[in-house]
Interface confidence: medium
């Protein structure tokens, strides 16, 4: 019985198409596959950012794979050929590993890269990113932002920078068509006559950084002699009602009765005739059914109801 062996894939490489972190891993079939013409060869691919404890593992019949990486760090990947048990009279055969790495040669010291990068997708409509210049960089340093997401032909540069003292410190993005629920890649690089500037890479999904507008049209309705219903409306904009959680803060005279998270646009209180004044404010956030994370809106305008007028249904703003 001769031992069955198979070679690793050939020409294994990581290709950077210029999408700011979305990379292609590609390879060619192994040499000497002639003995296994009747077989469908598979490949086991493992890859990770250098420094990560866990490998991502993919088994595929294709000769390529695409995924997103953090280009602030290097990338390592390895692949081997798998011959299924059907081809080898009963036991799976694996080749040795072919390995490759990829990294962008860093320019400049880490302190020169942008600091405190912060991106907010206002009301699921307008993306705005802001940053602070690197530590110790001179005023001649300028930063440029590039972005890409699946659907764009190539990475685009920001066309509407926010400036302070002549330096770019933020970007107002144009309308981003079909850009949510997918990775959004950003690179902020820089230039200076004085010294090289380190680039920074960021990846997020837009639906997870939404800051909605606050709820509107806050009202009180007396449901019965001892019940008052607080109501409000979803903020204007594209976010559907099913995507909201609310936090409501209710004050009675000088005391905060409740700060509670609610899923609907109503909240009911049982009151007594002694209540002199009720006030409430509400804020909104995208909920777990529509995103993995989000940012609370600002608080709504306060709506108050004077206790003396509770029976008369007088509203105060």
């Amino acid at each position: 019985d001769t031992e069955i062996k198979v070679n690793p894939p050939q020409d294994f490489e990581i290709v950077d198409p210029g999408y700011l972190g979305y990379l292609y891993l590609q390879w060619q079939p192994p040499l000497s596959l002639d003995h296994f013409k009747e077989c469908t060869v598979e490949y086991e691919l493992k890859y990770r950012n250098i420094g990560s404890e866990t490998w991502k593992t993919i088994i595929t019949k294709n000769l390529h794979y695409k995924d997103g990486f953090d280009l602030n760090k290097g990338i390592e990947a390895k692949i081997h050929t798998l011959l299924p048990w059907q081809c080898t009279n009963g036991s799976e055969v694996q080749s040795s590993w072919a390995e490759t790495t990829y990294w962008i040669s860093p320019q400049g010291i880490p302190e020169t890269k942008v600091q405190d990068m912060d991106c907010v997708y206002y009301n699921w409509q307008y993306l705005l990113c802001s940053w602070k210049p690197g530590i110790g960089v001179l005023l001649d340093t300028n930063y440029n932002l590039f972005y890409w997401y699946e659907g764009l032909d190539h990475a685009l540069q920001c066309v509407d920078y926010i400036k302070a003292d002549g330096q770019n410190i933020g970007c107002r993005f144009p309308y981003l068509e079909a850009s949510d629920y997918k990775d959004f890649y950003i690179c902020v690089n820089g230039s200076s006559e004085n010294k090289p500037i380190r680039s920074s890479y960021f990846t997020f999904q837009l639906q997870n950084i939404v800051k909605p507008l606050p709820p509107v049209y806050l009202t009180f309705t007396r449901e019965s002699s001892c019940e008052i219903k607080l109501k409000w409306s979803i903020p204007l904009g594209p976010i559907p009602a099913r995507c909201f959680d609310y936090e409501i803060e209710i004050r009675e005279d000088d005391t905060t009765l409740v700060t509670a998270t609610v899923e609907n646009e109503t909240y009911t209180l049982k009151t007594t005739n002694e209540t002199r004044q009720l006030c409430f404010v509400v804020r909104s956030k995208v909920n777990i059914y529509c995103s993995d994370d989000g940012i609370w809106s600002e608080w709504s305008d306060k709506q108050c109801w004077e206790g003396e007028d509770l029976s008369k249904k007088t509203l105060l703003r």
């Epitope: 000088d254 005391t255 905060t256 009765l257 049982k270 209540t275």
Partner: nanobody, 121 residues
């Protein structure tokens, strides 16, 4: 100093009842309100109910119609009557003062040490 001591927790069957108590000291109880929060393992703190000095009560949908909060000013004690208990009511329950700008009430929220409520089928 403001002090809250909560008690009455324990185990109950689904559909059963428990009554929690919270005795306060260190401030004028009758001039202030009281509330309860709860926290289940691995979950965020959740508001359960509150009652103001005027008797205004508020309940989220998750407990409305099943839980009732009341005050006994003579005993400086608040009570939380929990009926028709569900598995998802399992948590540590904390009684709390209500933050107030009034001079006779605590300015910030104080909590009791908590009491475990376990509901099983």
């Amino acid at each position: 100093a403001v002090q809250l001591v909560d008690s009455g927790g324990g185990s109950a069957q689904v559909g059963g009842s428990l009554k929690l108590s919270c005795t306060a000291s260190g401030y004028i109880f009758s001039s202030c309100g009281m509330g309860w929060y709860r926290q289940a393992p691995g979950k965020k703190r959740e508001f359960v109910t509150s009652v103001s000095k005027y008797g205004t009560t508020t309940y989220p949908d998750s407990v409305k119609g099943r839980f009732t909060i009341s005050l006994d000013n003579a005993k400086n004690t608040a009570y939380l009557q929990m009926n028709s208990l569900k598995i998802e009511d399992t948590a540590v329950y904390y009684c709390t003062t209500l933050a107030s700008r009034g001079t006779t009430c605590p300015a910030s929220v104080y909590s009791g040490p908590g009491t475990q409520v376990t509901v099983s089928s």
